[in-house]
């Protein structure tokens, strides 16, 4: 008795984070024995789509010509071979940006900070939101979440960093969102460059832009300070 068919691989091109209106292609790669591919979307009737394999039959293409809210979500794919259906692929989370207005990201008291001191990144949205995300470019784990606990909505979230070290330096953006869909994000904020200068205690020079994928501030959990606990926002690392 042969074992279960190996699960296919699922991915998106040009990536899994897509701006509203842009095109995206979802690929499902199985085996050369595949006769049909099926794509399922969580919380949608199954199958979400079916495609015949492309030669040499080991993969199928699912095209989204223009990204909209209804395409954002969690997908899995399967393939059918002469012996039956495969195991499901690992999930693909397709995220749409541009669902909400562009937030503003600023650094308090300044984006120029001395090592050992404190800085707070402030993400402000135009309309009340319940989730704020801080992203550091080229970080291994780029997401920092502040999420409202009771659906309470606010116009801003604070991301305190203390004490600041050279690894905090780099380029940050923030997004805002509503908890009803983790797959819908705002437009990205303009980038904010956080520049960490040395001090007497820490004379090492700090790059003005983080170029490594080594640990960044998101790998050093910090308790929210200031107004954040009172605003009902809770921190999550992903």
């Amino acid at each position: 008795q042969a074992g279960p068919l190996p699960k296919p691989t699922l991915w998106a091109e040009p990536g899994s984070v897509i701006s509203w209106g842009n095109s995206v292609t979802i690929w499902c790669q199985g085996t050369l024995e595949a006769r049909e591919y099926r794509l399922d979307k969580e919380e949608s009737p199954a199958p979400w789509d079916r495609q015949n394999p492309l030669e040499p039959k080991n993969k199928a293409r699912f095209s989204i010509p223009s990204m909209t809210e209804d395409y954002a979500g969690r997908y899995r794919c399967y393939y059918r071979s002469p012996v039956g259906w495969s195991q499901p692929s690992d999930p693909l989370e397709l995220v749409m940006t541009g669902a909400y207005s562009k937030p503003t990201l600023s650094a308090l008291p300044s984006p120029l900070v001395t090592s050992g001191k404190s800085v707070t990144l402030l993400c402000q949205s135009r309309s009340p939101m319940d989730t704020f995300l801080l992203i550091k470019e080229r970080a291994a784990h780029p997401l920092l979440h502040l999420r409202s606990e009771h659906g309470a909505q606010q116009h801003q979230a604070e991301f305190p960093m203390s004490p600041v070290t050279s690894v905090h330096g780099g380029t940050y953006r923030c997004f805002s969102s509503h908890g009803f869909s983790h797959y819908l994000l705002s437009h990205p904020s303009d980038p904010l460059e956080l520049i960490v200068s040395g001090s007497l205690e820490d004379p090492r020079p700090s790059p003005t832009r983080s170029v490594s994928t080594a640990a960044g501030p998101e790998d050093q959990p910090l308790m929210p300070t200031g107004s954040v606990p009172h605003s009902g926002l809770r921190r999550h690392w992903e």
Partner: antibody, heavy 122, light 110 residues
Framework: EVQLVESGGGLVQPGRSMKLSCAAS????????MAWVRQAPTRGLEWVSS????????SYRDSVKGRFTISRDNAKGTLYLQMDSLRSEDTATYYC???????????????WGQGVMVTVSS | DIVLTQSPALAVSLGQRATISCRAS??????????IHWYQQKPGQQPKLLIF???DLASGIPARFSGSGSGTDFTLTINPVQADDIATYYC?????????FGGGTRLELK
């Protein structure tokens, strides 16, 4: 205070063109998605078109697709609507508006200009 | 397109509660959010956003305005009605493209 001032309306013959402008002030124009909404006595309020803050994406209602072009100049703080091949059914007051986002779920209109009248008639 | 139906007019006395309804031809809910929005338009003026996402009060709008409902049936409540509230009220949906408006309800004095 947010201010949106439309201009460029008037009387135009069917098949001809017209360009509306909207001068924005009192907010960071380059951060806001924008839209045009029109209002005709016979058809009520109708969303016409939207554009992202950077001009990178646009959206149109089916009846104006291929005839109208929305654009913006962030340096000037101005939104535009180029209207070609105009029809009598395009007769309406056209409003310039800020929009939460170009995405359908967020196409609600938080600030409105005073509107400009476009009459398409021979 | 999603069609939003509003009754053309509602007569109300000053100081009383006004309830303006809006019915959608299909659900305008997305998860726990209801994608309906309310506007006020006075004669000769542009519309003004009152309520977004069914129940969130827009900036600068007095608390006597409130919104409720889910799925296909929504209500804008004004309590108490003041003379300045005499206007036409429109609902709008953003669940499906294109965004569409109701025909408007004219609020009149009894």
């Amino acid at each position: 205070e947010v201010q949106l001032v439309e201009s460029g309306g008037g009387l135009v013959q069917p098949g001809r063109s017209m360009k509306l402008s909207c001068a924005a002030s009192g907010f960071t124009f380059s951060n806001f998605d924008m839209a045009w909404v029109r209002q005709a006595p016979t058809r009520g309020l109708e969303w016409v078109s939207s554009i992202t803050y950077d001009g990178g994406s646009t959206s149109y209602r089916d009846s104006v697709k291929g005839r109208f072009t929305i654009s913006r100049d962030n340096a000037k703080g101005t939104l535009y609507l180029q209207m070609d091949s105009l029809r009598s059914e395009d007769t309406a007051t056209y409003y310039c508006t800020t929009v939460e986002s170009i995405a359908t779920i967020s196409t609600y209109f938080d600030y409105w200009g005073q509107g400009v009248m476009v009459t398409v008639s021979s | 397109d999603i069609v939003l139906t509003q009754s053309p007019a509602l007569a109300v006395s000053l100081g009383q509660r006004a309830t303006i309804s809006c019915r959608a031809s299909q659900s305008v809910s997305m998860s726990r959010y209801d994608l309906i929005h309310w506007y006020q338009q006075k004669p000769g003026q542009q519309p003004k956003l009152l309520i977004f996402r069914a129940s969130d009060l827009a900036s600068g709008i007095p608390a006597r305005f409130s919104g409720s409902g889910s799925g296909t049936d929504f209500t804008l409540t004004i309590n108490p009605v003041q003379a300045d509230d005499i206007a036409t009220y429109y609902c709008q949906q953003t669940r499906k493209s294109p965004p569409t408006f109701g025909g408007g309800t004219r609020l009149e004095l009894k």
